[in-house]
């Protein structure tokens, strides 16, 4: 006999990256019929929905509008169906960004390379941090940490097509408050390749908004960034 | 030491071609780019082109696609780059030149006459 | 194509002045500028990098600055040794372009 339903899938509208004071929508999406959702934050209830009526409704927001520090960290949620409750959904870790200040990114050898050259950023913050966080818009969202007094490099080895893109660099204060996001800096990568299969270029999504897509699951479409936040995310922990 | 030891200078006639050599020793070849650049009589430096050891890739000044090819043998550590259908425009120094962000390490350079 | 302008063509000086040599970008490249030496019969020689970067070996007395589009190199007392032609370099963007040079002569 089923002791428990199926874990919930929770995510973050329009993002996992939230800057502070601005709004953000936690969303945890069960099953039809869930009678209550539980929003958990750190370990702790931060939040309950019943929805109404529940046989027609598989999905409940949790809205912020006022990001903060406080607000910043680990969130997970439950429901429960009758007197059965679900697993709990993977923990999405929601960071609270533009804080103190602004980092500067830089790349070298320069901005435009050739496929196979070896590439490293320089993420620079000169307040009180230690951690970076590179990341490249896209459906992939590579997102690499880095370390250092006042800035981190980021190598990225040689190169191919499938590196072109727009990249952004954070300070990190913790793991869940970051800074201002640095300047974009567009990585172009040229040359002809001899009997070189080469990933094709990554789709780029647009830099005021950081994008949206959709991601195919067992259970249909889910809307946002479940993919690229459980990238960073995993980064993250 | 870095060394990039360029093949000696060229004498050759319209419509030929000439291949140069720039041996490099002292790094990993694979690890950095190697680019040409040509110095005409007194005049500035134009960049021709490079490539990734590592991969073959190349990039060209447009002005210079089809005139010179670019390649590499990366056992002997060697960059080549062939020049065709030369004339006396082709008259010139060329230099090899590591980019290790910026041109770090310059070949001496080989001179090209272009003469009937 | 990115253009590097180069000012003055050519600078003539005495030992021991302090000199400036301009290069403008026909675009923003950031600091993404480099700065070569060549002296007569020689090869070009890295003095800096990035707009404002020492390199190793060479001397203090050069030094860079600017970002953007507008940059210069510094010679803060000349020698004699120092004579020659001074090419600024785009960084940035393909192709990688040279100014025309400033050519540092004595008077």
């Known amino acids: 006999q089923q002791q428990t339903l199926p874990k919930p899938f929770i995510w973050a509208e329009p993002h996992f990256m939230v800057p502070k004071e601005k709004q953000v929508t936690i969303c945890c999406q069960g099953n039809y019929g869930a009678v209550e959702y539980q929003l958990h934050f750190e370990g702790s209830l931060f939040a309950v929905d019943r929805p109404k009526p529940p046989e027609r409704i598989n999905k409940v927001q949790f809205y912020i509008p006022d990001m903060n520090s406080r607000m910043a960290g680990q969130y997970s949620c439950i429901y429960r169906v009758g007197e059965l409750w679900s697993e709990p959904s993977n923990l999405l870790d929601l960071v609270v960004t533009e804080m103190y200040d602004t980092p500067t990114l830089s790349v070298h050898p320069g901005p435009e390379v050739i496929s196979g050259e070896k590439v490293t950023f320089y993420c620079r913050l000169d307040t009180a941090t230690s951690m970076f966080l590179l990341l490249k818009e896209g459906r992939s969202s590579h997102v690499q940490r880095g370390y250092g007094k006042v800035q981190a490099e980021f190598p990225l080895g040689p190169v191919t097509t499938a590196h072109r893109g727009t990249y952004r660099c954070f300070g990190s204060y913790n793991n869940h408050a970051w800074s201002f996001p640095s300047e974009p800096v567009k990585l172009l990568v040229t040359g002809d390749i001899e009997n070189t299969s080469l990933a094709p270029e990554d789709p780029t999504f647009p830099a005021d908004t950081w994008g949206t897509y959709l991601l195919t699951t067992e259970t249909g479409l889910q809307k946002d960034h479940a993919l690229w936040d459980h990238t960073a995310q995993n980064l993250l922990r | 030491e870095v060394q990039l030891q360029q093949s000696g200078p060229e004498l050759v006639k319209p419509g030929a071609s000439v291949k140069i050599s720039c041996k490099t020793s002292?790094?990993?070849?694979?690890?950095?780019?190697m680019h040409w650049v040509k110095q005409s009589h007194g005049k500035s430096l134009e960049w021709i082109g490079g490539i990734s050891p590592n991969i073959g890739g190349t990039s060209y000044n447009q002005k210079f696609k089809g005139k010179a090819t670019l390649t590499v043998d990366k056992s002997s550590s060697t960059a080549y780059m062939e020049l065709r259908s030369l004339t006396s425009e082709d008259s010139a120094v060329y230099y090899c030149a590591r980019r290790g962000g910026s041109f770090d390490y310059w070949g001496q350079g080989t001179t090209l006459t272009v003469s009937s | 194509d990115i253009v590097m302008t180069q000012s003055p063509a050519t600078l003539s000086v005495t030992p021991g002045d302090r000199v400036s040599l301009s290069c403008r970008a026909s675009q923003s490249i950031s600091d993404y500028l480099h700065w070569y030496q060549q002296k007569s019969h020689e090869s070009p020689r890295l003095l800096i990098k990035y707009a404002s970067q020492s390199i190793s070996g060479i001397p203090s007395r050069f030094s860079g600055s600017g970002s953007g589009s507008d940059f210069t190199l510094s010679i803060n007392s000349v020698e004699p040794e120092d004579v020659g032609v001074y090419y600024c370099?785009?960084?940035?963007?393909?192709?990688?372009?040279f100014g025309a040079g400033t050519k540092l002569e004595l008077k």
């Open positions: 002292g790094y990993t070849f694979t690890e950095y780019t």
């Open positions: 370099q785009n960084g940035h963007s393909f192709p990688l372009t």
